[in-house]
Interface confidence: medium
Amino acid sequence: GSQHIRAEKAMVDGSWLDLAKRSKLEAQPFAHLTINATDIPSGSHKVSLSSWYHDRGWAKISNMTFSNGKLIVNQDGFYYLYANICFRHHETSGDLATEYLQLMVYVTKTSIKIPSSHTLMKGGSTKYWSGNSEFHFYSINVGGFFKLRSGEEISIEVSNPSLLDPDQDATYFGAFKVRDID
Amino acid sequence: GSQHIRAEKAMVDGSWLDLAKRSKLEAQPFAHLTINATDIPSGSHKVSLSSWYHDRGWAKISNMTFSNGKLIVNQDGFYYLYANICFRHHETSGDLATEYLQLMVYVTKTSIKIPSSHTLMKGGSTKYWSGNSEFHFYSINVGGFFKLRSGEEISIEVSNPSLLDPDQDATYFGAFKVRDID
Amino acid sequence: GSQHIRAEKAMVDGSWLDLAKRSKLEAQPFAHLTINATDIPSGSHKVSLSSWYHDRGWAKISNMTFSNGKLIVNQDGFYYLYANICFRHHETSGDLATEYLQLMVYVTKTSIKIPSSHTLMKGGSTKYWSGNSEFHFYSINVGGFFKLRSGEEISIEVSNPSLLDPDQDATYFGAFKVRDID
C-alpha cells in the first residue's frame, strides 16, 4: 500500500513538475535584436529594416524566430514590444540633402493568414539639423503592450535610414511575453 | 491507511507550496530609483550619476541592492531595464555655457568578475537652446530587455548633469526581472 | 484503497489547478488605451485627457476598469506603466498661436481614499516650430515601475492637446501587472 501511494505521489509530483516547467518564467518567449550596420539601406525615404543581429553582443532570442528581417511570433500571448532608434550625423560625412528632417520609427505587425500590415506604434520628430553644428543626434523610444498570435510578424520601418546610429546600444528593438491570452 | 495518505498529500502540498512561493511573482527582483538632487554633479561633461533614492516617494527596491551609486543584481535573470532623464534650464539660472547642447543618457553594465563596463542603451539629442526662450526642457526615455548575472552592476551616465530636472517623476531609472535564464 | 488514493490525488491536482490558475500569467491585469480623437480638448493649456478607447483596434483591457477618463486599478500589485504621446501640426491647419511650444505629458495617480493626485512620470520637450516648415511632429515616451493599490486611478495630462496626433499607434497609454506586493 505504502509503495503504491509513493508511486501515486511521484505521479502527482511528476505531472506538476511538467506543468511548473511549462508555466515557469523561463518558458516565456523574448527577443532583443540589434541593428546590423553592414546592411543599412541608403537614402532618406521610409524603409523596412531587415538586417538585425539576434545572437551576438546584447542581441538574443528565445521561443521566437527571426527570419527575412522580421521577428516571428511562435507562441500566442500578450507581449510588451519596444524599440529604440538613434539617428546621427557628423559634418565629416558630408552635407545633408536637406536640413529639415523627419526622423521616424514605425513598429508594424504583419499577419500572414490575412495578408495585412498595421502600425502598432510610431514615434519620432521633425528636426532642423543646421549646418552651424558639426554633430547632430536624436533618439526615439516607443513601447506598448499588444496581443500577438503565432505566425504574426513584427518589423521596423524608419525614415532616413542612412542616418541610423549603428551601435548595438543605440538602435534595437525587442519583445517579451508577459501573459497568456485568456 | 487514510491518515498515511493525508500525510503524503500534505507533503505534496507542502513541497508545492515551497515551489509556488519560489516561483511566485512576488519573489521577482525590481528597483525604481529616483534622482537625489542634493548631490548632482556640476558642469557639462559626461558623468556617472551616483546619488539615487531607493526608499522614498516612488523609489523602491526588492531583491536587488543599491550601493556606491550602482544598482546591483542579486539574482540571475532576464530583466527589463529603463531610464527616464529630464533636462531643463530657466534663464533665471544664468547663462548656458553654450546654446548648442548634447543631452545624453547611457545605461551601463559593469561586471566585477571580469572588470569591464559596457553601454547597454543610449539615447538623447543634440539641442539648440536659444536665448529667445526663457525656459527649455527635454526628456529622454530608453528601455530594453537584458540578461543580467548576480553581481553585475547597472549605472547611469549623463552629459550636462547640471541641467538635470531633480523631480522624482522626471529623472529615474529602474529594472524588473521578467524571467529566469534557461 | 486504490480508489481512495486516486480521489486524494484528484484533490491534490484540483487544489493545485486552482492555485495554478490563480497565479497563472493570464490572471494578470493589463490595459492599453488609445486616444479617442472625437473628443480632444482644444487650446494650448495643460489638460487631463478623458477620452480613450479600451476595446477597439489595439485598445484592450483586462482586470482593470476604464471610467470617467481614468484607468482604475482593481488588483494590488507592481505595474509597469507607459505612455506614448505624439504631437503634430501641418500648415494647412492654420498658424500656431506661438512658435515656441512646451509639449509635455504627465502620468498621474489619484488616490480616492486619501483625495490626492501625484505625478508618477513626466516627459516632453520645448520646441520651436518655425513657420519655415510646413509640417512638425514630436513624440514623447515615458515608462516606469510603480506600486498600485486597488481603487487608485491613472490618468494622462498633456499640454497643447489640440496638437495631439489622433492615430491609435501614436497616442496611447497602458499598464500591465508584473508582480504581487510582498
Epitope: N132 | E91, D95, E99, Y128, G131 | Y128
Partner: nanobody, 122 residues
Framework: EVQLVESGGGLVQAGGSLRLSCAAS???????MAWFRQAPGKEREFVAA????????YYADSVKGRFTISRDNAKNTVNLQMNSLKPDDTAVYYC????????????????WGQETQVTVSS
C-alpha cells in the same frame, strides 16, 4: 509687419563714444536681439547679443570691455553703448532680432534693420 529701425550712428574720433539704438515694432513676443557690423570688403560679423530677459549678454572678443548691450522691453528697444572706439570699429552696423541658429551667426537671425554708419577717425 516686423520693423527694426536703427539710430545713433555718426562720425567720432578714436577714443570717443557713440550710442546706437534699435527700435522694434510688430514683434509679437520678445526675442534675442543683436548687433552685427560689416566693414568694406569684409564679411558681416557679430558684435553683441542680449537674450529676451536681458540677463544674458554675449560679445565678440574684439569689443569685450568696450561695448555694452542693453535692452528696454517696455519700449521694445535695444541699445549698444560703444566706448573707447578705434578706427577698426568703422563699419555699417545692423540690428537683428530672433536668433534661430546661434547668437553669433548672422545667417540665423530672422529680422534685420536697414543699417547705420559708424566712422571712427584717427
Amino acid at each position: 509687419e516686423v520693423q527694426l529701425v536703427e539710430s545713433g550712428g555718426g562720425l567720432v574720433q578714436a577714443g570717443g563714444s557713440l550710442r546706437l539704438s534699435c527700435a522694434a515694432s510688430g514683434l509679437t513676443t520678445v526675442y534675442t536681439m543683436a548687433w552685427f557690423r560689416q566693414a568694406p570688403g569684409k564679411e558681416r560679423e557679430f558684435v553683441a547679443a542680449i537674450t529676451r530677459s536681458g540677463k544674458t549678454t554675449y560679445y565678440a572678443d574684439s569689443v569685450k570691455g568696450r561695448f555694452t548691450i542693453s535692452r528696454d522691453n517696455a519700449k521694445n528697444t535695444v541699445n549698444l553703448q560703444m566706448n573707447s572706439l578705434k578706427p577698426d570699429d568703422t563699419a555699417v552696423y545692423y540690428c537683428a532680432a530672433k536668433a534661430l541658429l546661434g547668437m553669433t551667426n548672422p545667417a540665423g537671425y530672422e529680422y534685420w534693420g536697414q543699417e547705420t554708419q559708424v566712422t571712427v577717425s584717427s
